[in-house]
């Protein structure tokens, strides 16, 4: 078979303060030495860029300096964190594995991970 | 408006070259994959070339290897591909196409024709 | 390389008939990997459906796609008068990216 298998959580609850991590691990059928992680939104039918970052296998992933994700990679396992998210945020993210090099290139799309984000209750005014 | 466009194509003696270009507007060009594609009259559709968000990787079909050369300007929202030595059997409609984030090719140009005959 | 093979090379039928392609794969891909596009004469082809059963944008549900491993099939509920045209399918999980031949269809 020559499909790359993308898995990844199907769903995770975002902590109060936005932040919500989740591992995407990918079966590579070939030995990359440069890999491509992006994580998209899927809202409907549309589907955004969140962030992307690309790797050489064994070092840690570059995400741009103003990137909401960060993340770590360990072998074919990828531990991706999105920060700075709000209640309309929630949403399907997708993980896409891409294995740019050596040839040849293959392509993983994950399920998707439902993030369920929810506000804080702004804390009541104290009348001490 | 999303879309790209062709240009560049033309009549040429076989063993000569050409360059073609393809105009992207209405999105973030280097969020994407590229991609040319190329049609013989009448026939199917043939991948002919890839290239990597930031250029850094491509890849190319047999037919073409070592004869074409694909390469873009994300500055310029600009996809181009060089082709030598080319040969009777290079005529057909080039389209460049955007690889998609869930990766078809999502959005495709007008065509540019490329016939090469002496 | 993934060799794709459709089936039939020409569908001939009337409009309201329902049209049934096929596009087998030479080895197993994934059913997220595969594409059908439509194609009419002097215009560039257009995304039909995506990751073997995914309407494209602005795609009329009366196109669905089916099918996992190695066969696909790209269905026509009710054949419109712009739906006869030529249909490709398409691998996209690997290098090369490979399409079928084509099925043409075609007004009886």
């Known amino acids: 078979c020559k499909a790359m298998h993308v898995a990844q959580p199907a769903v995770v609850l975002a902590s109060s303060r936005g932040i919500a991590s989740f591992v995407c691990e990918y079966a590579s059928p070939g030995k990359a030495t440069e890999v491509r992680v992006t994580v998209l939104r899927q809202a409907d039918s549309q589907v955004t860029e969140v962030c992307a970052a690309t790797y050489m296998m064994g070092n840690e992933l570059t995400f741009l300096d103003d990137s909401i994700c960060t993340g770590t990679s360990s072998g074919n396992q990828v531990n991706l964190t999105i920060q700075g998210l709000r209640a309309m945020d929630t949403g399907l993210y997708i993980c896409k594995v891409e294995l740019m090099y050596p040839p040849p290139y293959y392509l993983g799309i994950g399920n998707g991970t439902q993030i369920y984000v929810i506000d804080p209750e702004p804390c009541p005014d104290s009348d001490f | 408006e999303v879309q790209l466009v062709e240009s560049g194509g033309g009549l040429v003696k076989p063993g000569g070259s050409l360059r073609l270009s393809c105009a992207a507007s209405g999105f973030t060009f280097s969020s994407y994959t590229m991609h040319w594609v190329r049609q013989a009259p009448g026939k199917g559709l043939e991948w002919v070339s890839f290239i990597s968000y930031d250029g850094n990787y491509k890849y190319y079909a047999d037919s073409v290897k070592g004869r074409f050369t694909i390469s873009r300007d994300n500055a310029k929202n600009s996809l181009y591909l060089q082709m030598n030595s080319l040969r009777a059997e290079d005529t057909a409609v080039y389209y460049c196409?955007?690889?998609?984030?869930?990766?078809?090719?999502?959005?495709w140009g007008q065509g540019t024709m490329v016939t090469v005959s002496s | 390389e993934i060799v794709l093979t459709q089936s039939p090379a020409t569908l001939s039928l009337s409009p309201g008939e329902r049209a049934t392609l096929s596009c087998r794969a030479s080895?197993?891909?994934?059913?997220?990997?595969l594409a059908w596009y439509q194609q009419k004469p002097g215009q560039a082809p257009r995304l039909l459906i995506y990751?073997?059963?995914s309407r494209a944008t602005g795609i009329p549900d009366r196109f669905s796609g089916s099918g996992s491993g190695t066969d696909f099939t790209l269905t026509i509920s009710r054949l419109e008068p712009e739906d006869f045209a030529v249909y490709y399918c398409q691998q996209y999980g690997s290098s090369p990216w490979t399409f079928g031949q084509g099925t043409k269809v075609e007004i009886k």
């Open positions: 080895q197993s891909v994934g059913s997220s990997y």
């Open positions: 196409a955007r690889g998609g984030h869930l990766g078809p090719f999502d959005l």
């Open positions: 990751g073997a059963s």
